[in-house]
């Protein structure tokens, strides 16, 4: 697994503890939480990092403050359960027996139930929204401008392919990124969109996940891009069962 | 390879003010946190307080507040410790420290002597 | 505020002993405790990260245990070039330093 050799780091992920204990004395880092392997060349899955998340040192919360712009969203934290290859497991259950069915991104799709709560599937989001504000400027941003400088911050940044980034919308101050990406398009070793979603979302927040690197500076011609509101949309490829009750209320 | 370079020895009178410099060089500056420690003579390790380059937002230790400020120049991938109303137990070798991923100090700086003499 | 205990604070092996150093956090502090060698003149040098994770370029006769509260930091073979001192240091919850221990030759 790729890993900065010389000082033994990885540079995708800061929440790993690496060590050169690997084939040879190579580096290897492993997610903290979970305690396994990840592959430093890439990112790593959300599901890896919200489990590391909540085993990560206090002063992950409380020495990085979300940068002054970044608004605190409901993060939906939790402690989740990954499958050996980091992705979350359809069902996720808390402490106290509750259970949930989830999708890819590991954000809840059904109503909570027990243990007897079945979740056949893990269903793939296979749409994401990515609805930005950014705070006034003197002119509204050139719109080709802005969907270059977008497209190429996810495919340099979070190595994820251009096919997946299907539109940037603009309509200032709303920039509106949409990320596709069907089980059938996704090739070995294509970046998932909900894993560049959630590296971006930390981003935004000055939250950064990579190592060794500060908070994104997003510039557009020169004039700096500042966002001070995010929201996500997540779509399935099979719609959530919810029950009416939930939906009325 | 990641350098830190503290600025010279400073000798001080008490009730003077002394601000020392850390120049970070071989890796992002705004990507990591840097931390000052104290050694008195003879005495053990303090950590001191920390600084996020990135956003400039700095954390010290209940002992040192009101003694000390943590300031950053990312221009010149600097950072400074300035130390207020100098006393004779202010004395000690100071060090700038890289906060690693996980916050642990991977790299050090030579130290800087802070003598405070009448 | 976090504690560190840090014991014995001076301990005198030969060349090729098995020295052992320990640190008592006065909380959990899961597994964020590093390890650090300084000698007179010169910076802190980390030997050992996440309890132990043996930094890059450190003797493997170096090593670390522990978990929650109680650590334990150990030379396996001394060797002349050791003799230093140890601090521990805890990162979870704000940055601690044990009180050391000063390592001498018999």
């Known amino acids: 697994h790729t890993a900065a050799q010389d000082n033994c780091t990885c540079p995708t992920n800061k929440m790993t503890v690496c060590s050169p204990d690997g084939p040879g004395g190579r580096c290897q880092c492993r997610a903290l939480g979970s305690g396994m392997a990840v592959d430093c060349s890439t990112l790593t899955s959300k599901c890896l990092l919200l489990k590391a998340r909540m085993s990560a040192p206090k002063n992950a919360r409380t020495l990085v403050r979300p940068s002054e712009h970044a608004l605190v969203d409901n993060d939906g934290l939790y402690d989740p359960d990954c499958d050996p290859e980091g992705r979350f497991k359809a069902r996720q259950c808390n402490q106290t027996s509750v259970c949930w069915c989830v999708n890819s991104v590991g954000v809840r799709r059904t109503d909570k139930g027990d243990l007897s709560l079945r979740c056949d599937e893990l269903v793939r989001t296979h749409h994401i929204l990515i609805d930005l504000r950014h705070r006034p400027t003197a002119g509204a941003f050139n719109h080709s401008d802005l969907d270059a400088e977008l497209r190429r911050l996810f495919r340099e940044r979070y190595r994820l392919h251009p096919k997946f980034v299907a539109a940037v919308h603009y309509e200032q101050p709303t920039i509106q990124i949409e990320l596709r990406q069907n089980t059938s398009q996704k090739a070995a070793g294509d970046v998932d969109i909900g894993d560049a979603a959630y590296y971006f979302e930390r981003d935004i927040k000055g939250e950064s996940l990579f190592q060794g690197r500060g908070g994104l500076d997003l510039r557009v011609r020169g004039e700096p891009l500042q966002v001070e509101r995010t929201l996500i949309y997540y779509l399935d490829e099979i719609p959530p069962k919810f029950s009416m009750k939930r939906l009325t209320a | 390879q990641v350098q830190l370079v503290q600025s010279g020895a400073e000798v001080k009178k008490p009730g003077a003010s002394v601000k020392v410099s850390c120049k970070a060089s071989?890796?992002?500056?705004?990507?990591?946190?840097m931390n000052w420690v104290k050694q008195a003579p003879g005495q053990g390790l303090e950590w001191i307080g920390i600084?996020?380059?990135?956003?400039?937002?700095?954390t010290y230790s209940q002992k040192f507040q009101g003694k000390v400020t943590i300031t950053v120049d990312k221009s010149t991938s600097t950072v400074y410790m300035e130390l207020s109303s100098l006393r004779s137990e202010d004395t000690a070798v100071y060090y700038c420290?890289?906060?690693?991923?996980?916050?642990?100090?991977?790299?050090w700086g030579q130290g800087t002597t802070v003598t405070v003499s009448s | 505020d976090i504690q560190m205990t840090q014991s014995p604070s001076s301990l005198s092996a030969s060349v090729g002993d098995r020295v052992t150093i320990t640190c008592q956090a006065s909380?959990?502090?899961?597994?964020?405790l590093a390890w650090y060698q300084k000698k007179p003149g010169k910076a802190p040098k980390l030997l050992i990260h996440?309890?132990?994770n043996l930094q890059t370029g450190v003797p493997s006769r170096f090593s670390g245990s522990g978990s929650g509260t109680d650590f334990t930091f150990t030379i396996s073979s001394l060797q002349p070039e050791d003799i230093a001192t140890y601090y521990c240091?805890?990162?979870?919850?704000?940055?601690?330093f044990g009180q050391g221990t000063k390592l001498e030759i018999k």
């Open positions: 420290a890289r906060g690693a991923g996980l916050y642990y100090f991977d790299y």
């Open positions: 071989g890796s992002s500056f705004t990507g990591y946190t």
């Open positions: 600084i996020n380059p990135y956003q400039g937002d700095t």
């Open positions: 909380q959990d502090i899961n597994k964020y």
């Open positions: 996440y309890t132990s």
């Open positions: 240091l805890q990162y979870d919850d704000l940055f601690t």
